[in-house]
């Protein structure tokens, strides 16, 4: 377990589940102070491995709405607009932290959860398995 | 502010900042029960827009370690291994939730924070600006 550092300014916890249960301020601090010009929302259309965005909503989760990527093609789009099936469009996935209401419907009690989300797609050279 | 819903099983909060301050169980539940065979860790090498992974560590953050993608090239890699500068390698970014210790060094008090991370790279057709 974690020992409490000698910092008298820390909130105390008498909870028997301490340190698994902690206090979290939901007033989100956004570190992305300036809008990132490179964070384009049209990459999903301009990519050689384009994707569609699918809406996943779960009111018991925080964030409740997550937009997930699904690759449009098995192959990758060539300069002429045709699909090259010698290459593969694959989802780039990331494990992210979310909060799950626990017990359900409670506005002020959550549990951390890890979920795997597809963020976008990339074009890769396929792994070719040679038969002996 | 939010009134506690009529669910007597919900923990109460007398905190004056309620509902911004909530209880969170850090005992992470992992929804990804089976290992996804498609979640390959070698896409960063096989992609036409390959990337390197950089370790970002911050002991005051949970999770402390985040791996960030940085595209290797401005252009995209062609079948012959050369870089095509008529196309662009761009980072696919996602806003994720992390917990930041607040006050600093406190083990049981956090604030939610949104940070923008680069998860991987994709190859896109550049936007061409025509000069009149």
């Amino acid at each position: 377990g974690i020992a409490i550092p000698r910092n008298s300014g820390c909130p105390n916890s008498e909870d028997k589940n301490f340190p698994r249960t902690v206090m979290v301020n939901l007033n989100i601090h956004n570190r992305n102070t300036s809008t990132n010009p490179k964070r384009s929302s049209d990459y999903y259309n301009r990519s050689t491995s384009p994707w569609n965005l699918h809406r996943n909503e779960d009111p018991e989760r925080y964030p409740s709405v997550i937009w997930e990527a699904k690759c449009r093609h098995l192959g990758c789009v060539k300069a002429d607009g045709n699909v090259d099936y010698h290459m593969n469009s694959v989802p780039i996935q990331q494990e992210i932290l979310v909060l799950r209401r626990e017990p359900r419907h409670c506005p002020n009690s959550f549990r951390l959860e890890k979920i795997l989300v597809s963020v976008g797609c990339t074009c890769v050279t396929p792994i070719v398995h040679h038969v002996a | 502010g939010i009134a506690i819903p009529r669910n007597s099983g919900c923990p109460n909060s007398e905190d004056k900042n309620f509902p911004r301050t909530v209880m969170v169980n850090l005992n992470i539940h992992n929804r990804n029960t089976s290992t996804n065979p498609k979640r390959s860790s070698d896409y960063y090498n096989r992609s036409t827009s390959p990337w390197n992974l950089h370790r970002n560590e911050d002991p005051e953050r949970y999770p402390s370690v985040i791996w960030e993608a940085k595209c290797r090239h401005l252009g995209c890699v062609k079948a012959d291994g050369n870089v095509d500068y008529h196309m662009n390698s761009v980072p696919i970014q996602q806003e994720i939730l992390v917990l930041r210790r607040e006050p600093r060094h406190c083990p049981n008090s956090f604030r939610l924070e949104k940070i923008l991370v680069s998860v991987g790279c994709t190859c896109v057709t550049p936007i061409v600006h025509h000069v009149a």
Epitope: L53, E57, D58, Y62, P63, V65, W67, H105 | -
Partner: antibody, heavy 121, light 107 residues
Framework: EVQLVQSGAEVKKPGSSVKVSCKAS????????IHWVRQAPGQGLEWIGV????????FYNQKFDGRATLTADKSTSTAYMELSSLRSEDTAVYYC??????????????WGQGTTVTVSS | DIQMTQSPSSLSASVGDRVTITCSAS??????IDWFQQKPGKAPKRLIY???ELASGVPSRFSGSGSGTDFTLTISSLQPEDFATYYC?????????FGQGTKLEIK
């Protein structure tokens, strides 16, 4: 103060298109989705679809899929709803409303004032 | 699609009356519902969110309850400004759907 200000009334011919705007202010545009709802004269509320300004994602009520196009311009914090192949049944008041994607608990909290679209030959 | 059926579709009541409007989902179990009030020529105004929660600035005579498929909006003591049309709205199940509305009129 949170505000959603919509464009003015439109009169359109059958078969044409209309584009309604919804300018948001007083909050971080990227943190909320914009949902569109319409109300025909004397009728109830009907959900058209949703646009996420942050990702560019859109999701439509199947009834409007193919005819409705939802977009957003992050630089001006403005959302748009375009409806094509207009028919008389599309005569309605069109509303935009923001939706907290971080916490559905809060639902559709602020609404635009509505834009009246009349389709008539 | 999940259909939300409101009852009654209209009702007449007097100032001071206690009024109950119900909303039933056609199938499945709804996570949360919202209740909106709408006056002629105006945009809907949210009264209740997440089934039970009173929206900011809404008088405490309004309350919400229910779970699963059956939900209720109660006005404990009708005031003159409460005469309007009320809509329930389910969220979390595609597509979002609204009840057909309940018109509350002065008796």
């Amino acid at each position: 103060e949170v505000q959603l200000v919509q464009s003015g009334a439109e009169v359109k011919k059958p078969g044409s298109s209309v584009k309604v705007s919804c300018k948001a202010s007083g909050y971080t545009f990227d943190d909320y989705e914009i949902h569109w709802v319409r109300q025909a004269p004397g009728q109830g509320l009907e959900w058209i679809g949703v646009n996420d300004p942050e990702s560019g994602g859109t999701f439509y009520n199947q009834k409007f899929d193919g005819r409705a196009t939802l977009t957003a311009d992050k630089s001006t914090s403005t959302a748009y709803m375009e409806l094509s192949s207009l028919r008389s049944e599309d005569t309605a008041v069109y509303y935009c409303t923001r939706y907290d994607k971080w916490d559905s608990f809060y639902g559709m909290d602020y609404w635009g004032q509505g834009t009246t679209v009349t389709v008539s030959s | 699609d999940i259909q939300m059926t409101q009852s009654p579709s209209s009702l007449s009541a007097s100032v001071g009356d206690r009024v109950t409007i119900t909303c039933s989902a056609s199938s499945g179990s709804i996570s949360y519902i919202d209740w909106f009030q709408q006056k002629p020529g105006k945009a809907p105004k949210r009264l209740i969110y997440a089934t039970f929660e009173l929206a900011s600035g809404v008088p405490s005579r309004f309350s919400g309850s229910g779970s699963g498929t059956d939900f209720t909006l109660t006005i404990s003591s009708l005031q003159p400004e409460d005469f309007a049309t009320y809509y329930c709205h389910q969220l979390g199940s595609y597509p979002d759907t609204f009840g057909q509305g309940t018109k509350l009129e002065i008796k």
